[in-house]
């Protein structure tokens, strides 16, 4: 039977235990918020908030400035002092709930859990490549704020998301806060609001528009705001909330809320349910139709996509897509299927679906029984009626009231369940060349950088490495600064290159030079690296062949052996066709003549595994000595492949030339009819790849082969006679003169 090269798993070409050290900053406490700034004069900064403190870092993550944001009531609180002499409210620690840039000024705005959730504005003062914060301004006017009406009460201790939008000369803060009965009773924060920053930075203009969970639902209906972003003409909030006001509050789902970014009003507030599922290629018995639902959004990010993913999503390259990581429930641990799935929602499609939903509600003829929804924000009503009213009045428009679109937007896991046990806790998507890369942080403190592509049954990793030794979860919010992403884990901020932390996790030259161009990987003799790591020997254009195994491990000194070589970078072409004169194999001093590929033996090799085979005929030279020697494969003048050309030599020891010796044959006679079981004894009888016992020139069928013994069944004899018996190994006769006597049956 033909010997076949063992498959090498694809994973063997990389090592995700390789340690990478990326720049980091120890903040001195659990990182609560982080935002980056890049100015137009090459100045940049990272702002990092922990309890009671705000750090300003340079682009190198070195501390530039530090500001005390608490505790409230403490004389050392610098932001509190900006509000003038106190007291301003109950004393206590300040946990930063909001940290955003107002791009118009530019300025940094921070809002904390203390002092009724008020905010502070810090002008950015770029000096050289560094950025400093000016003295803080207190965005709170005591005489404008009351417990029942507080335009300057922004942050909720339960969590707040803010997106700042410039409209004309004004900055509008789109604010979404989680509420409960206790929070709602204290200085009346709102669930969703749009607030204009006053020109004199003394707070927010009164009379702002808002939606809030109705008092009767506050106890049972809580909305978590997971992410907010601004793209095109809209601001979007992503929420996790109970699927129904009336049913089980623990049955959660994910919604997208859309607000106009051009008009500071909430009449066109729209919500849409986002449905993300895992639909395995082969459905298990009893598995739900359409796939297993993953209703709870954990993290999200929107980004323009590269060409390849755009094609798969049937959209144009560069279009904005919302990516979300979903889990099955709040605890994130499902019974079956992966822990995390990733779904992609093109923004244009979301908008189209919302707009169609508005038409369904408001167009004639009326769709009976179609609800306006959002009963936690407004009185129940049926389309096209406004909330709480039986009918439209002549001067109101159906379109000028908030609406839950009746249909949901369903998508399936881009990764096809391949994230498996990984619990993703952070997500940022970038477009590199025409590739779309998901940069994901995990529950156990790792960073996964993976190409977002739908059509494969394995993950295409840029990298997969541990941020540090703490193993603490990577936090939800990720920021970009130039060509780096900033991830927070525990009390540390880490700076990760979007191109990946390095190339050392690629173990083979072939894998190294097949890496994405943007990674800048090259081969350095025996490791994969970036040019700065090994400037002398670094190259990106060729790989030597790599021998990993061969068969057999021994061959006869006289006679030929069919040698099978295993490894990688033999051909670069799936057909395995070798141009004349490119591959030279020597075993010891002896050449091994390349054999043409037997096309009937070509097997498709899945990308998850890889191995290349090369066969040659070994004919030892007369000068070849008995004993151990090396197998050497040299490839030259090969036409280049897609990523590199093969060029170089690979040597593997462990082949031995041996001289088979035949010592005894028994029995020396047998019936003319044949079938006598002959036993040939000797040494090195199993070397090489072919052997034959000839009785009067006819092959004696081999039943067993070992190093010291051959068993075969004699062929029938023509007549009763003594006939020559010989052993050939590799086509050459083993010395010795033996006869076998055919007798009458």
């Amino acid at each position: 039977e033909d010997w076949q090269c063992p498959r090498t798993p694809y994973a063997a070409s990389r090592d995700f235990d390789v340690k990478y050290v990326v720049p980091s900053f120890s903040a001195g406490g659990l990182v609560q918020a982080m935002v980056t700034y890049e100015g137009d004069r090459n100045e940049s900064a990272v702002f990092v908030a922990i309890r009671n403190r705000l750090h300003v870092l340079g682009p190198d993550l070195k501390s530039v400035q530090s500001l005390a944001t608490g505790p409230a009531g403490d004389p050392g609180c610098q932001t509190c002092a900006a509000c003038g002499p106190g007291p301003h409210g109950p004393p206590g620690d300040t946990d930063t709930k909001v940290l955003v840039l107002d791009p118009a000024l530019p300025a940094l705005v921070s809002c904390g859990s203390s002092l009724q959730g008020r905010c502070f504005l810090h002008d950015l003062e770029p000096q050289g490549t560094a950025v400093h914060l000016a003295a803080p301004a207190c965005l709170f006017s005591a005489h404008h704020n009351r417990p029942d009406d507080c335009p300057d009460c922004v942050a909720s201790p339960l969590g707040t998301r803010v997106t700042v939008v410039e409209q004309g000369q004004a900055s509008y803060f789109y604010v979404a806060s989680s509420l409960d009965a206790a929070v709602a009773a204290s200085f009346s924060p709102r669930s969703v609001s749009i607030r204009r920053l006053k020109a004199d930075a003394s707070g927010f203009a009164p009379g702002f528009v808002a939606l809030s969970v109705l008092p009767k639902h506050l106890v049972s209906y809580s909305i978590e705001y997971v992410h907010s972003f601004h793209t095109g003409a809209f601001v979007y909030f992503l929420t996790v909330q109970p699927a129904s006001v009336t049913d089980d509050p623990s049955a959660l789902h994910t919604r997208l809320a859309r607000l106009s970014a051009t008009e500071p009003e909430l009449g066109d507030y729209r919500e849409l349910v986002l449905d993300c599922r895992f639909a395995p290629k082969r459905r298990r018995r009893g598995a739900p139709e359409g796939g297993q639902p993953y209703p709870v959004l954990r993290v999200a990010h929107s980004a323009p996509v590269g060409a390849q993913l755009a094609t798969e999503l049937s959209i144009a390259e560069g279009q904005e897509v919302l990516f979300g990581v979903f889990v099955t429930g709040k605890d994130g641990g499902p019974g079956v299927g992966p822990n995390s799935v990733v779904c992609a929602f093109p923004i244009d499609l979301l908008d189209t679906l919302i707009d169609e939903g508005v038409e369904r509600c408001c167009e004639s003829p009326v769709h009976p029984g179609l609800r306006r929804g959002l009963d936690f924000f407004q009185s129940p009503s049926f389309c096209p009626n406004p909330p709480g009213l039986e009918a439209l009045s002549p001067n109101t428009s159906c379109r000028h009231f908030p609406l839950l679109v009746s249909s949901s937007f369903s998508r399936v896991d881009l990764f096809n369940g391949l994230l498996g046990p990984v619990q993703v806790t952070a997500l940022y998507v970038t477009r590199l060349d025409n590739v779309t890369v998901a940069h994901m942080g995990t529950m156990d403190g790792r960073i996964l950088q993976v190409e977002l592509v739908r059509s494969l049954n394995y993950l295409l990793y840029v990298s997969n490495f541990s941020l540090g030794d703490s193993g603490q979860p990577v936090q939800r919010d990720v920021s970009r600064l130039g060509d780096h992403l900033l991830f927070a884990s525990g009390d540390q901020v880490f700076q990760v290159p979007i191109q990946g932390p390095g190339c050392r996790h690629f173990l083979t030259c072939g894998r190294c030079l097949r890496a994405w161009h943007f990674m800048g990987c090259g081969w350095c003799g025996n490791m994969c690296g970036q040019q700065k790591e090994c400037p002398g020997s670094w190259q990106q254009d060729h790989c030597p062949p790599k021998l990993t195994e061969f068969h057999p491990h021994s061959g006869p000194l006289r006679g030929s052996t069919r040698l099978t070589l295993c490894g990688s970078n033999f051909y670069l072409h799936p057909s395995g066709l070798v141009p004349e004169g490119t591959h030279q194999v020597t075993v010891g001093q002896s050449p091994c003549r390349p054999l043409p590929k037997d096309s009937s033996k070509l097997r498709p090799v899945p990308r998850k595994d890889f191995v290349e085979e090369f066969e040659c005929e070994l004919e030892p030279l007369g000068t070849q000595a008995v004993g151990p020697t090396n197998v050497s494969l040299t490839v030259t003048n090969m036409p280049p492949g897609k990523h590199f050309r093969v060029d170089g030599t690979s040597v593997l020891r462990g082949f031995s030339f041996m001289e088979p010796v035949l010592i005894a044959v028994q029995p020396l006679f047998g019936p003319r009819a044949g079938g006598t079981c002959l036993t040939l004894e000797g040494q090195s009888l199993s070397v090489g790849t072919s052997r034959a016992v000839l009785v009067n020139g006819t092959e004696c069928l081999l039943a067993r082969v070992s190093e010291g013994q051959l068993l075969c069944a004699t062929p029938p004899g023509a007549t009763v006679a003594s006939v020559p018996l010989s052993l050939q190994v590799g086509g050459a006769q083993v010395p010795g003169s033996w006869t076998f006597q055919y007798r009458e049956d």
């Epitope: 530090s66 005390a68 003295a135």
Partner: antibody, heavy 117, light 108 residues
């Protein structure tokens, strides 16, 4: 090189008004916080007022709050101090100074304001 | 308000001697937010030290700052004739910004 030149000082009667100007050159004016500091004859330094680079934040010493207004025009690289309801105790040399987090690293030569009847 | 108290009010020393000036705050000042200034008669103040211990541009190495919390020190390791002047500390940690009353270093 960095230069700050104050102007607008002079003699004024109690209850009167003056507007001080500080012309800045040699640096990116709209990247720096600015302050006014005064020094009464034979006395120490007293901080008067502060304005952040984009005018978002202004602060005043209690002694001048409600009477003085600090402002800036970044397009003209000029800092102002509008002084109303002047009193005899406002008599001093008024300096404009650049900076906040790295201290007040550059000062003008000062302009004298005398409030007297 | 944070009150800064400088001592001594006057320091009489000879050229070449070491001068140690003290500034005490009524409440803690983060070391990032304290400066020292030198002023000569008829001239504007000049920044010597910012962030309690960082020398400003062009300031000779004989000037050094130290301290944290409520106690800060300006040291002139060896007085030069041009160093005889009045020295002020200033906090810019919290509004209102405040100066110490000054220490006059005079020739003995």
């Amino acid at each position: 090189q960095v230069q700050l030149v104050e102007s607008g000082g002079g003699l004024v009667q109690p209850g009167g008004s003056l507007r001080l100007s500080c012309a800045a050159s040699g640096f990116t004016f709209n990247s720096y916080s600015m302050s006014w500091v005064r020094q009464a004859p034979g006395k120490g330094l007293e901080w008067v007022s502060y304005i952040s680079s984009r005018s978002s934040t202004t602060y005043y010493a209690d002694s001048v709050k409600g009477r003085f207004t600090i402002s800036r025009d970044n397009s003209k690289n000029t800092l102002y101090l509008q002084m109303n309801s002047l009193r005899a105790e406002d008599t001093a040399v008024y300096y404009c100074a650049r900076g906040y987090f790295h201290g007040m690293d550059y000062w003008g030569q000062g302009t004298l304001v005398t409030v007297s009847s | 308000d944070i009150v800064l108290t400088q001592s001594p009010a006057t320091l009489s020393l000879s050229p070449g001697e070491r001068a140690t000036l003290s500034c005490r705050a009524s409440q803690s000042v983060s070391f990032d937010y304290l400066g020292w200034y030198q002023q000569k008669p008829g001239q504007a103040p000049r920044l010597l030290i910012y962030g309690a211990s960082n020398r400003a541009t062009g300031v000779p190495a004989r000037f050094s700052g130290s301290g944290s919390g409520t106690d800060f020190t300006l040291t002139i390791s060896s007085l030069e004739p041009e160093d005889f002047a009045t020295y002020y500390c200033q906090q810019y940690y919290n509004m209102p910004y405040t100066f110490g009353q000054g220490t006059k270093v005079e020739i003995k």
